[in-house]
């Protein structure tokens, strides 16, 4: 007779790992016990549990409660076991040993390996400002048995650097990705995968990019310098920019107050029925938490008595 | 002829603890499971322990589990019973007996000693 | 325990059946004590097996999970207490003995 088992068992942390063992003996031949010992290198042999052909199982206290036989029907020449819920201290070599009649005793081994899937975790760099040159976005870190694979999935120009930490059982990889932040990569997605055959799928964290930054201002409405005539009604200036965060915007006049009747909403400035007394230089002032911009305008409101117009200077400073 | 010799018994203290020894002879001793059985004054036969051929595999009645501890010596042919927490039921004729096979069954007794007698009291 | 009579009795010549059950495993033996205090004495072990010093008049047979001592032509020699063993999960066992009168 000879006995059939496996080189190697894998099984996923948490999940039941059958070591199978058996005895393909000619007819007549009867198995008395079949023992099952943990074998690693350098140790000596750790008795798991015994299948006895009268006795029926034992487990040695080690194993309590985690050692059981394969559910009915049983051959009686198949001493396979189960071992429950297994863990990564579980992973090594295996003895199965048979005793037949009369055939004698007959061994073999076989390697557990416990695939141990890892708990991907993403984070964040520091604030990405534009302007800055090249920037940690995100470090993603994954352990697992064995190594994990750790890539990124991204729209987004940049570079990544890996870095793998072994400890006894098991592996950390780290992986880094840099770039140099510019406004276009606001709100795109920063995607760490990580592969490994413990997963039934990869596992992917997704990361939205906020790059912080302020536009030039600019102010429009003054487009067309001959509306703005005594009398016109809805005269407005609005002041434009962009930025991360959103920015607030502030406007003041700089050769004296706002005029009277004058509304301020946001960006927006809103003038009553024009009068020579809006004429002047009005200055819109935009910040967020990574800067601010001014733009100012000069208005000058035309008397249609007058012949002449007048010019108008547009001035941006930052 | 098998024979088991068994030693160790008297009177001892409550609370302490005793060591009884069998040596074995007349048969292959490594090949055969071993046992304690015992008998209180007046009671039936009660399984104490037993022990497997290769000694990696021991079983205990439950009225000595946790306080007792069965081993075999191959090169001794012997067994022994270290039964510690001493209390007054233990006290009886400790018989040690042979497996006709690798376990310790009792349906598998084909052999026994003359047995030892212990008794707990102060 | 395994569970056995307390007693049986038969006059000399007759044939006296003990039965035992129980335990977790189908095999037992049956043991023979004369007078408490004396060794045991195999009669029957691995449910069928008789040592060889052991007259024939012992035999044992199994039906179904009860199992039989069958002592055929009682002798006065015979009286005893007659302890059936056997497993239970983890450990070995035994019944609490049944006491055979010979009238």
């Known amino acids: 007779g000879e006995l059939e088992t496996s080189d190697v068992v894998t099984v996923v942390l948490g999940q039941d790992a059958k070591l199978p063992c058996f005895y393909r003996g000619d007819s007549g031949e009867q198995v008395g016990q079949v023992a099952w010992a943990r074998v690693d290198a350098g140790e000596g042999a750790q008795e798991l549990a015994l299948l006895h052909s009268k006795y029926g199982l034992h487990v040695s206290p080690a194993y309590e409660g985690r050692v059981e036989q394969p559910p009915p029907p049983r051959n009686p020449l198949d001493g396979s076991v189960l071992l429950r819920n297994a863990v990564q201290a579980d992973e090594g070599e295996y003895e199965c040993r048979v005793s037949t009649f009369p055939a004698g005793s007959f061994q073999a081994r076989l390697r557990l390996r416990v695939l141990v899937p890892p708990l991907p975790s993403l984070n964040p760099g520091p604030a990405l400002e534009e302007g800055q040159g090249l920037t940690l976005a995100a470090s993603c870190t994954a352990e697992g048995s064995p190594a994990p694979s750790v890539t990124w999935d991204t729209e987004v120009k940049g570079t990544t650097s890996s870095r793998s930490f072994k400890h006894s059982r098991s592996a950390a990889v780290t992986s880094e990705f840099h770039l140099v932040p510019s406004r276009s990569m606001n709100g795109q997605p920063l995607t760490c995968v990580v592969s490994h055959p413990g997963l039934l799928q990869d596992q992917r964290i997704t990361h939205i990019l906020h790059v912080s930054f302020l536009a030039e201002a600019s102010v429009r409405g003054l487009e067309d310098q001959n509306l703005w005539h005594i009398g016109r009604e809805g005269a407005m200036l609005k002041c434009l920019s962009e930025g991360q965060p959103p920015p607030s915007y502030n406007w003041t006049r700089l050769d004296g107050p706002l005029p009277s009747g004058v509304r301020v909403d946001g960006d927006t400035l809103g003038f009553p029925p024009l009068t020579t007394e809006h004429s002047g230089i009005y200055v819109c002032h935009v910040s967020n938490e990574f800067s601010s911009r001014d733009s100012q305008v000069t208005v000058d409101v035309l008397d249609p008595q007058e012949d002449s117009g007048k010019q108008v200077d547009l001035v941006s400073a930052s | 002829a098998v024979t088991l010799d068994e030693s160790g018994g008297g009177l001892q203290a409550p609370g302490g603890g005793l060591s009884l020894v069998c040596r074995a002879s007349g048969f292959t001793f490594s090949s055969h499971g071993m046992f304690w059985v015992r008998q209180a004054p007046g009671k039936g036969l009660e399984f104490v322990a037993g022990i497997s051929d290769a000694g990696s595999w021991t079983g205990y009645g439950a009225a000595v589990k946790g306080r007792a501890t069965i081993s075999r010596d191959s090169g001794q042919s012997t067994v022994r019973l270290q039964l510690n927490n001493l209390r007054a039921e233990d006290t009886g004729i400790y018989y040690c007996?042979?497996?006709?096979?690798?376990?310790?069954?009792?349906?598998?007794?084909?052999?026994w000693g003359h047995g030892t007698e212990v008794i707990v009291s102060s | 325990a395994l569970t056995q009579p307390s007693s049986v009795s038969a006059n000399p010549g007759e044939t006296v059946k003990i039965t035992c059950s129980g335990g977790?495993?189908?095999?037992y033996g049956w043991y023979q004590q004369k007078s408490p205090g004396s060794a045991p004495v195999t009669l029957i072990y691995n449910n069928n097996k008789r040592p060889s010093d052991i007259p024939s008049r012992f035999s044992a047979s199994k039906s179904g999970s009860t199992h039989t001592l069958t002592i055929t032509g009682v002798r006065a020699e015979d009286e005893a207490v007659y302890f059936c063993g056997g497993w239970d999960k983890s450990a070995g066992i035994f019944g609490a003995g049944t006491t055979l009168t010979v009238l």
């Open positions: 007996a042979k497996s006709a096979g690798d376990w310790y069954g009792a349906d598998d007794i084909d052999a």
């Open positions: 977790s495993s189908n095999y």
